[in-house]
């Protein structure tokens, strides 16, 4: 089955999620969708 990256880097500030996951470019894989940082 698929092997993929699923990074969930974020911090919580005043109950609001602030993500700092790095931008996903075409050289790193395809965005899986509906998850955090998942590429394949």
């Amino acid at each position: 089955d698929a092997e993929f990256r699923h990074d969930s880097g974020y911090e919580v500030h005043h109950q609001k999620l602030v993500f700092f996951a790095e931008d996903v470019g075409s050289n790193k894989g395809a965005i899986i969708g509906l998850m955090v940082g998942g590429v394949v």
Epitope: D1, A2, E3, F4, S8, Y10, V12, L17, F19, A21, V24, G25, S26, G29, A30, I31, I32, G33, L34, M35, V36, G37, G38, V39, V40
Partner: antibody, heavy 121, light 111 residues
Framework: QVQLVQSGAEVKKPGASVKVSCKAS????????IHWVRQAPGQGLEWMGF????????NYNQKFKGRVTMTRDTSTSTVYMELSSLRSEDTAVYYC??????????????WGQGTLVTVSS | DIVMTQSPDSLAVSLGERATINCRAS??????????LNWYQQKPGQPPKLLIY???KQGTGVPDRFSGSGSGTDFTLTISSLQAEDVAVYYC?????????FGGGTKVEIK
């Protein structure tokens, strides 16, 4: 604008195979995985799996393991879903879809128009 | 596999009134304080459309009358003031792990 355009309706006999295509446009094809979801007449939604246009790696719902194959052709920005050993229960509308990750700053989805596959003897 | 169960199966609500749909997962769909729970709207003859993601966040272009709540295993979709164009089937779905799975759907009609 982002578009996913699927191939036309198919009628197949039990035991046969069907190959549905999904042609993507309006974005860089290799940047998003393409998912397949099916819906039997009057029924709910069922996730079949996805394939990565970037790597060609696929992840399938175990329910379809051994019967489903998802591939891509980067030269035509097209993804294919092939389902073999068809039975009447496979009669459904098959959708391809693309989703954003939660961390994109905005999240939306794009769906093909659906392809009706009818399995009948 | 995670099983998603929705209730009720159908719901008739007067125009302008509140509609509430429930969704329960067979196990937690939370991970690192995020709920991987999404809601879709599907109108007849159309593909589904993402309304709510991460349990509470509105998808792009979704009207403010649609809101989501919950965490862990129990979730709710609320339409605060039902409009005629909201007649549809609504599905919850988890994207925490593969295979992704959907609830059986809730049909919303006008009373």
């Amino acid at each position: 604008q982002v578009q996913l355009v699927q191939s036309g309706a198919e009628v197949k006999k039990p035991g046969a195979s069907v190959k549905v295509s999904c042609k993507a446009s309006g974005y860089t094809f290799t940047t998003y995985a393409i998912h397949w979801v099916r819906q039997a007449p009057g029924q709910g939604l069922e996730w079949m799996g996805f394939t990565s246009p970037y790597s060609g790696v696929s992840n399938y719902n175990q329910k379809f393991k051994g019967r489903v194959t998802m591939t891509r052709d980067t030269s035509t920005s097209t993804v294919y879903m092939e389902l073999s050993s068809l039975r009447s229960e496979d009669t459904a509308v098959y959708y391809c879809a693309r989703f954003d990750n939660y961390d994109r700053g905005y999240v939306r989805d794009y769906w093909g128009q659906g392809t009706l596959v009818t399995v009948s003897s | 596999d995670i099983v998603m169960t929705q209730s009720p199966d159908s719901l008739a609500v007067s125009l302008g009134e509140r509609a509430t749909i429930n969704c329960r997962a067979s196990e937690s769909v939370d991970n690192d304080r995020i709920s991987f729970l999404n809601w879709y709207q599907q109108k007849p003859g159309q593909p589904p459309k993402l309304l709510i993601y991460a349990a509470t966040k509105q998808g792009t272009g979704v009207p403010d009358r649609f809101s989501g709540s919950g965490s862990g295993t129990d979730f709710t979709l609320t339409i605060s003031s039902l409009q005629a164009e909201d007649v549809a089937v609504y599905y919850c779905s988890q994207s925490k792990e593969f295979p992704w799975s959907f609830g059986g759907g809730t049909k919303v009609e006008i009373k």
